[in-house]
Interface confidence: low
């Protein structure tokens, strides 16, 4: 049972997870809903959402992004390449979602749900993917040092990082959702 969840509340034992496209679609929309709540708290707490210095901070974060070569856009769509990109991207986001865990006061529950729901989404997608060999898993040591580095930033940078992670994760999921609907 994931930390912070009651055993009765994770998939409520009797409700079997479905791995159909519809289920994946719903899982993503559920996560996006959680992100929406987290973004509300972030934007209410600081002025990061209107900040013009975003680009500078963004360069220091290696947040996953969809590019033309990933095959997820309508032009040059490639199901296998795209699926690999989505899974790889989500795996890369996991360290950033871990970072978000102590970043919220009133939305602590939501932050945990977003993190755990993403883990489940990855599992769903891995079942769907045929070419699992092409999926590179982030190095745990690298992730651990990245997490330490992010947590050592000053308050302003931490707020900025939180905002950027949420914004990028939302965009990545929205792109993933559009692509998965074509599969």
């Amino acid at each position: 049972v994931p930390p912070g969840e009651d055993s009765k509340d994770v998939a409520a034992p009797h409700r079997q997870p479905l791995t159909s496209s519809e289920r994946i679609d719903k899982q993503i929309r559920y996560i996006l809903d959680g992100i929406s709540a987290l973004r509300k708290e972030t934007c209410n707490k600081s002025n990061m959402c209107e900040s013009s210095k975003e680009a500078l901070a963004e360069n220091n974060l290696n947040l996953p992004k969809m590019a033309e070569k990933d095959g997820c856009f309508q032009s040059g769509f490639n199901e296998e390449t795209c699926l690999v990109k989505i899974i790889t991207g989500l795996l890369e986001f996991e360290v950033y979602l871990e970072y978000l865990q102590n970043r919220f006061e009133s939305s602590e529950e939501q932050a945990r749900a977003v993190q755990m729901s993403t883990k489940v989404l990855i599992q769903f997608l891995q079942k769907k993917a045929k070419n699992l060999d092409a999926i590179t898993t982030p190095d745990p040591t690298t992730n651990a040092s990245l997490l330490t580095k992010l947590q050592a930033q000053n308050q302003w940078l931490q707020d900025m990082t939180t905002h950027l992670i949420l914004r990028s994760f939302k965009e990545f999921l929205q792109s993933s959702l559009r692509a998965l609907r074509q599969m």
Partner: antibody, heavy 123, light 104 residues
Amino acid sequence: QVQLVESGGGLVQPGGSLRLSCAASGFTFSNYYMTWVRQAPGKGLEWVSSIYSFSGDTAYADSVKGRFTISRDNAKNTLYLQMNKLKSEDTAVYYCTRDLGGVVVTANGYDYWGQGTQVTVSS
Amino acid sequence: DIVMTQTPSSLSASLGDRVTITCQASQSISTELSWYQQKPGQTPKLLIYGASRLQTGVPARFSGSGSGTSFTLTISGLEAEDLATYYCLQDYSWPYSFGSGTRL
């Protein structure tokens, strides 16, 4: 165990207002979508309104749109239904139900229902 | 809006019979359909979700099938305790909608 307890029903005149509450316990309320369903005397079930878990996004049946407002207080584990401009056709038992949610978003289906609260609109 | 047409509106059957209730959606709803049982004077109870998944504690004589626009609830070997009204619900897109019910 999971429990949903509705309250706030009663007799009200046409054009009047009522606020229904649903106290939830036994599960992580904030992680679930919640829904109100009603049943008029001797009639079938009618979906009334649903609310998303986190963002609070909402949806309504055409028959209540503009008159009813669904809301939730995740800190109090409570779901609400504010009913304004009530009509005689709103007379029904109102059920609070748990919709999809948890960490693994499974197939929908209202797996838990409250006992219902009676709303009667009559002059 | 999606309209759910449930048939028949009522049916009589004998104990041990195989009973079939159908729900037709006005447009494709994939497998986003659940079935509920409501016994007289009681609250509704979830039987089937995801068109064919049996809810915990529901006897195996109940089964659901279908996808797209056509769905079926089957009770194989009717028992006295199955006397109830049965409803389907599409939860594919808002506004969600119930079928009109089948009184057994």
